[in-house]
């Protein structure tokens, strides 16, 4: 069964679980003793087309309802757990008095006054954040919404929207709360070459091949222009007229501590003596900054097998 | 000294196509990004994009996505921006400039545009 | 797109006052990762290319006057001229370079009263 919650002595207006899209009549009931909840407003608790109206919640309503859409082929039941609670006296609102949670984002956000949709309700809807009425500018209640511009990680929080509820010539107060937080947008930063280290000195065999591989990491998310590239004697290796030498086609991307990283290699065919006296430059390099670490390579010491 | 020196102005027809150049000198040309940026007469000042001259790495302003291409040559140290689809509304003064940088050993911190091109006045008019 | 607002749009000093032109982003323009703002500062006479004065939101560019500060932190900022001269008749820009798009104010003129 569903469950509805509401606060004692505010208005709660709950539908049957059951009703999809029909347009069929609507029977309530208590659960536990069969009874015909009525549909004349004069009572506190009626029902109205497919809804149940507590018009002032009490605690003593919490049970559990029934609700059956009578239609020719067949009747469908619901059942609909509802628990009415006093007031909590502080501020800490708990978790069963909380609807779902918002996410939002670095830009602009709005949160939705929840179960709004069920009143007859006029604006302004009045929202508090962890009890305290929001007054910045930043804040703009617009029809059911609450709209937050620049949001920081220091707008997360329990958001609390109330409202009236008209019924009958007669005012309700309604008030629904939901947590609000900031998705962990993502960072960008000087780039870190995480290998080769900085004047780092790689052993070679003359006619062999060599691959160098530079990795480095540039934040998390969207990176804007984030590159890294290989240059020789400070010439990008398209431009330095050495067919042996070529810088891999496509970076590798990859993830690294919760950091967006790329790799590029540098792939020798075959080692020359030029080789060795060659400067080989990892370049990293984003909006922030370029950094630059240099290579060397030398001839590999035969072992020693005496 | 370090200089970027723009080519001249032109005069287009609505609809047509203009490349300005924009050639660096006194520095490396690969270790900055150049930007573009343009002012309209009495206007301020408009970002368009930008480029790193070693990979060619572009990124540019929403608004003219689609019509600019911004290249650069290493071989002549020199910057390109091609401006497409011409409209009266793109009369204006472009500018090149290059991205300041703090060097320290090896590092470049980037930041704001401290070498700035002559501009090239594009008057677009039927 | 971060949105650079500049105040006042004109501004007119007496030579040797003090001149301050105010600029606010939309949203914070500094970077937790290294404490740097990441604001410019540009002036540009008629006919003229823009011309750096103030980086990093407050340090100098070289051969600028040391009349020219900047300052602030976050999404407020201020440029001060503390003594206006003739040669700073001119009109303001402040950009941000923390997130693409740059942007920059709508550029604030000065002239003399």
């Known amino acids: 069964s569903k469950s509805s919650w509401g606060l004692e002595n505010e208005a709660l207006i709950v539908r049957c679980p059951q009703r999809g899209r029909s347009t069929y009549p609507v029977e309530w009931y208590y659960s536990d003793t069969n009874e015909s909840i009525p549909t004349q407003k004069r009572n506190r608790i009626f029902v109205s087309r497919d809804r149940l109206k507590f018009l002032p919640a009490r605690v003593e309503d919490s049970g559990i309802y029934a609700c059956v859409i009578r239609s020719p082929n067949l009747n469908k039941t619901g059942y609909l757990n509802v628990t009415i609670h006093k007031k909590p006296p502080s501020c800490n609102i708990p978790d069963y008095l909380m609807y779902s949670t918002v996410r939002g984002s670095d830009k602009n956000f709005k949160i939705t006054c929840p179960t709004i949709d069920l009143y007859n309700w006029t604006a302004p809807v009045q929202w508090f954040k962890n009890c305290k009425a929001l007054q910045e500018p930043r804040f703009r209640a617009h029809r059911s919404y609450l709209f937050i511009d620049n949001v920081t990680h220091d707008d997360e929080g329990d958001y609390t929207c109330q409202f009236t509820h008209a019924e009958n010539g007669t005012n309700y107060i309604v008030t629904a709360t939901r947590s609000f937080t900031v998705e962990e947008k993502g960072f960008s930063m000087f780039p870190v070459i995480t290998n080769p280290p900085y004047n780092h000195t790689m052993e070679v065999e003359i006619g062999k091949p060599a691959s160098i591989a530079c990795s480095a990491c540039f934040g998390k998310g969207s990176h804007f222009l984030a590159d890294v590239l290989w240059q020789i004697n400070k010439t990008v290796v398209g431009n330095f007229g050495e067919a042996r030498i070529q810088e891999e086609e496509g970076r590798n991307e990859s993830s690294s501590n919760d950091m967006d990283c790329l790799t590029s290699v540098l792939r020798i065919t075959g080692v020359t003596e030029k080789d060795l006296s060659l400067e080989y430059d990892c370049l990293a390099l984003n909006l922030h900054g370029m950094i630059r670490h240099t290579i060397r390579l030398r001839r590999k010491q035969p072992i020693d097998h005496r | 000294q370090v200089q970027l020196v723009q080519s001249g102005a032109e005069v287009k027809k609505p609809g047509s196509s203009v490349k300005v150049s924009c050639k660096a000198s006194?520095?490396?040309?690969?270790?900055?990004?150049i930007h573009w940026v343009r002012q309209a007469p009495g206007q301020g000042l408009e970002w368009m994009g930008i480029?790193?001259?070693?990979?060619?790495?572009?990124t540019y302003a929403q608004k003219f996505q689609g019509r600019v291409t911004i290249t650069a040559d290493e071989s002549t140290s020199t910057a390109y921006m091609e401006l497409s689809s011409l409209r009266s509304e793109d009369t204006a003064v472009y500018y090149c400039?290059?991205?300041?940088?703090?060097?320290?050993?090896?590092?470049?911190?980037?930041?704001?545009?401290?070498?700035w091109g002559q501009g090239t006045t594009v008057t677009v008019s039927s | 797109d971060i949105v650079m607002t500049q105040s006042p749009d004109s501004l007119a000093v007496s030579l040797g006052e003090r001149a301050t032109i105010n600029c606010k982003s939309s949203q914070s323009v500094l970077y937790s990762s290294n404490n740097r703002n990441y604001l410019a500062w540009y002036q540009q006479k008629p006919g003229q290319p823009p011309k750096l004065l103030i980086y990093w939101a407050s340090t100098r560019e070289s051969g600028v006057p040391d009349r020219f500060s900047g300052s602030g932190s976050g999404t407020d900022f201020t440029l001060t001229i503390s003594s206006l001269q003739a040669e700073d008749v001119a009109v303001y820009y402040c950009q941000q370079y923390y997130s693409v798009p740059l942007t920059f104010g709508q550029g604030t003129k000065v002239e003399i009263k």
């Open positions: 400039a290059r991205v300041g940088a703090t060097v320290t050993k090896n590092y470049y911190y980037y930041y704001g545009m401290d070498v």
């Open positions: 006194g520095y490396r040309f690969t270790d900055y990004y």
């Open positions: 480029i790193q001259p070693t990979g060619g790495g572009t």
